[in-house]
């Protein structure tokens, strides 16, 4: 669901975190359309997500404590 | 009709160790997070951790990361929270609260009727 | 020390508007939704008021919430003696040193 780097909706799939290995965050105000978190899988997928979802933002903060952790 | 329902009371010795078991009925264990939310007498609410079952990966308060551990069972969908190195100041009523992780809201729809741990010293 | 910030203690009489407030800052309400628990006396805390302003099945719509800023309020409308009970605002935090969930300390409603 993304265009230009852009994402322009959610999936509807919940990821596992054992998947992902790290994540951007698209802003609304920085020329995209919506807010997004663009997870980026083990298999060199981008995901995009809805960053107000509950387990996107668990697994946000769970690889930002692994990042500030190392 | 989803419930959460807990093990009883508990009176423990300080440095002791508690564990309280939080068991869901009538719904999937998939889509949720349980949380772990605690009141001392007379006091406020504060969340102590939470897991995502389906994850099978706990967080924790800053407070209580070297001395709690949530765990869970999908089997038997209960979710357990142990309680470590008990002091006085750790009695209090544990309740356990549920979120639909796939909603974009973040609130606890489904609380537990709560578990009273008392720590004498 | 709770991390939200409620007046501890709100009163009013059957019939009146009492509205409680809940102020907190950029990581938790300023950034995330908010709501908002009743809990009454010896029981669970029961959801009140998710997302700001809605309210789950059942909550009757005496009851609202609003938000602003990095501050929300709760108000109660036609009071009723069953109001009578504990009211927690609480919002996902995004600063990773603190919980996931933070709560405010609480506000005791007296139905005079």
């Known amino acids: 669901a993304s265009n230009f780097d852009c994402c322009l909706g959610y999936t509807d799939r919940i990821l596992h975190p054992k998947f992902i290995v790290g994540f951007t965050r698209q802003l609304a105000n920085e020329g995209c359309d919506i807010n997004a978190i663009i997870f980026h899988t083990k298999k060199k997928l981008s995901v995009c997500a809805n960053p107000k979802q509950t387990w996107v933002k668990y697994i946000v903060r769970l690889l930002s404590k692994k990042v500030k952790n190392m | 009709q989803v419930q959460l329902v807990q093990s009883g009371a508990e009176v423990k010795k300080a440095g002791s160790s508690v564990k309280v078991s939080c068991k869901a009925s009538g719904d999937t264990f998939s889509n949720f997070a349980i949380s772990w939310v605690r009141q001392a007498p007379g006091h406020g609410l504060e969340w102590v951790g939470g897991i995502i079952p389906v994850f099978n990966t706990a967080d924790y308060a800053q407070n209580f990361t070297d001395r709690v551990t949530i765990s869970a069972d999908k089997a038997t969908k209960t979710v357990y929270m142990e309680l470590r190195s008990l002091r006085s100041d750790d009695t209090a009523v544990y309740f356990c609260?549920?979120?639909?992780?796939?909603?974009?809201?973040?609130?606890?729809?489904?609380w537990g009727q709560g578990t009273l741990v008392t720590v004498s010293s | 020390q709770p991390v939200l910030t409620q007046p501890p203690s709100a009163s009013g009489t059957p019939g009146q508007r009492v509205t409680i407030s809940c102020s907190g800052s950029?990581?938790?309400?300023?950034?995330?939704?908010v709501n908002w628990y009743q809990q009454l006396p010896g029981t669970a805390p029961k959801l009140l008021i998710y997302?700001?302003?809605q309210r789950p099945s059942g909550v009757p719509d005496r009851f609202s919430g609003s938000k602003s800023g990095t501050s929300a309020s709760l108000a109660i409308s036609g009071l009723q003696s069953e109001d009578e009970a504990d009211y927690y605002c609480a919002a996902w935090d995004d600063s990773l040193n603190g919980p996931f969930w933070v709560f405010g300390g609480g506000t005791k409603l007296t139905v005079l």
């Open positions: 609260a549920r979120t639909k992780i796939e909603l974009d809201n973040d609130a606890f729809d489904i």
């Open positions: 997302s700001n302003n």
């Open positions: 950029s990581s938790n309400i300023g950034s995330n939704t």
